[in-house]
């Protein structure tokens, strides 16, 4: 039985230009994490393997960094950016979890970071 | 030890079949994304196809030439990668080699010792 | 299809700075890599990602990838870098290999 719940860092804003750290967390469970994949409307941005390391997608290697953690870095962003992204863990014996994050990349300097939120 | 080591080539009628294998041992295979590439006498490497780790869907991607005809997958459990070949053509005569993809620093670029595939009436 | 160019042949002096182009639309929008290979042998993997050197691989080699050309260097070219160069253009839905470069040590 799936006991985790994945908590992130839920809506988000960004200016253009700018960076912003996508995370989540795996909590309520005592599975072990062995893969997470972070992905942005089925194109896979980077992988995050807990015995082989990480791998950033080629089309991403430019603007995007590893961490902090399990988390990735977006940077040198676009209104192109916008859109949801999802942390998929791969977890023992649990099975998958997958977060949701959604990015708005505002032209303004007014850009807010949104409330967390928990996906079960 | 770290290795792949390929089996199953042979000589094989035009419209035939073969199966080739791929015996993984020394690293975490399951992860991996793995890919057969082949060389035909004389001439340079052709991507064949390949198959993503199940945690990252394991799908398959192909070359055209081969696409329809042949197909990969894996057996983690088994450590091993295949390669069916069907209705095969004079033209896939080559050596098959496996190779993982280079997806992580710590697991790139290995290569076995290929395997040669003659296809002759 | 997506298709990769190198020059055929090339030589070098020892001692001299090799630099072997690949060249394929877009290509800095994937990862560039090269292997090399002797008569007879495996392919061996020389360079990943673009500008990675696997462990074991001399320093003399390293690449670059930018734009829609890769390179491969090799500086202080010696007598046992005679050999076929392959670039490989590499991402999550592809991979291509360059027709391979011939590189006479003279």
């Known amino acids: 039985m799936m006991t985790g719940t994945i908590e992130t860092t839920g809506n988000i804003s960004a200016e253009k230009g700018g960076s912003i750290i996508l995370q989540c967390h795996l909590s309520s469970t005592t599975a072990q994490v062995t893969q997470v994949n972070w992905e942005q409307q089925d194109q896979l941005l980077a992988i995050c393997n807990a015995d082989l390391g990480w791998h950033i997608s080629p089309s991403f290697k430019d603007r995007v960094a590893p961490g902090p953690g399990l988390g990735l870095t977006l940077q040198s962003l676009t209104v192109n950016d916008t859109g949801e992204y999802f942390c998929i863990y791969h977890t023992y014996p649990d099975g998958t979890y997958t977060g949701r994050i959604f990015l708005e990349v505002l032209e303004s300097s007014v850009a807010e970071h949104g409330a967390r939120f928990q996906i079960p | 030890e770290v290795q792949l080591v390929e089996s199953g080539g042979g000589l094989v009628k035009p419209g035939g079949s073969l199966r080739l294998s791929c015996a993984a041992s020394?690293?975490?295979?399951?992860?991996?994304?793995m890919s057969w590439v082949r060389q035909a006498p004389g001439k340079g490497l052709e991507w064949v196809g390949r198959i993503k780790s199940k945690t990252n869907g394991g799908t398959t991607d192909y070359a055209a030439p081969v696409k329809g005809r042949f197909t990969i997958s894996r057996d983690d459990s088994k450590n091993t990668l295949y390669l069916q070949m069907n209705s095969l053509k004079t033209e896939d005569t080559a050596v098959y080699y496996c190779?993982?993809?280079?997806?992580?620093?710590?697991?790139?670029?290995?290569w076995g010792q290929g395997t040669l595939v003659t296809v002759s009436s | 299809s997506y298709e990769l160019t190198q020059p055929p042949s090339m030589s070098v002096s020892p001692g001299q700075t090799a630099s072997i182009t690949c060249s394929g639309d877009?290509?800095?929008?994937?990862?560039a890599c090269w292997y090399q290979q002797k008569p007879g042998q495996s392919p061996v993997l020389v360079i990943y990602?673009?500008?990675k050197r696997p462990s074991g691989i001399p320093e003399r080699f390293s690449g670059s990838n930018s734009g829609n050309t890769a390179t491969l260097t090799i500086s202080g070219t010696q007598a046992m870098d005679e050999s076929d160069y392959y670039c490989q253009a590499w991402d999550s839905s592809t991979v291509v290999f360059g027709g391979g470069t011939k590189l006479t040590v003279l």
């Open positions: 020394g690293f975490t295979f399951s992860y991996a994304w």
């Open positions: 990602q673009d500008s």
């Open positions: 190779t993982t993809d280079p997806l992580y620093d710590i697991l790139t670029g290995l």
């Open positions: 877009k290509l800095g929008d994937k990862y």
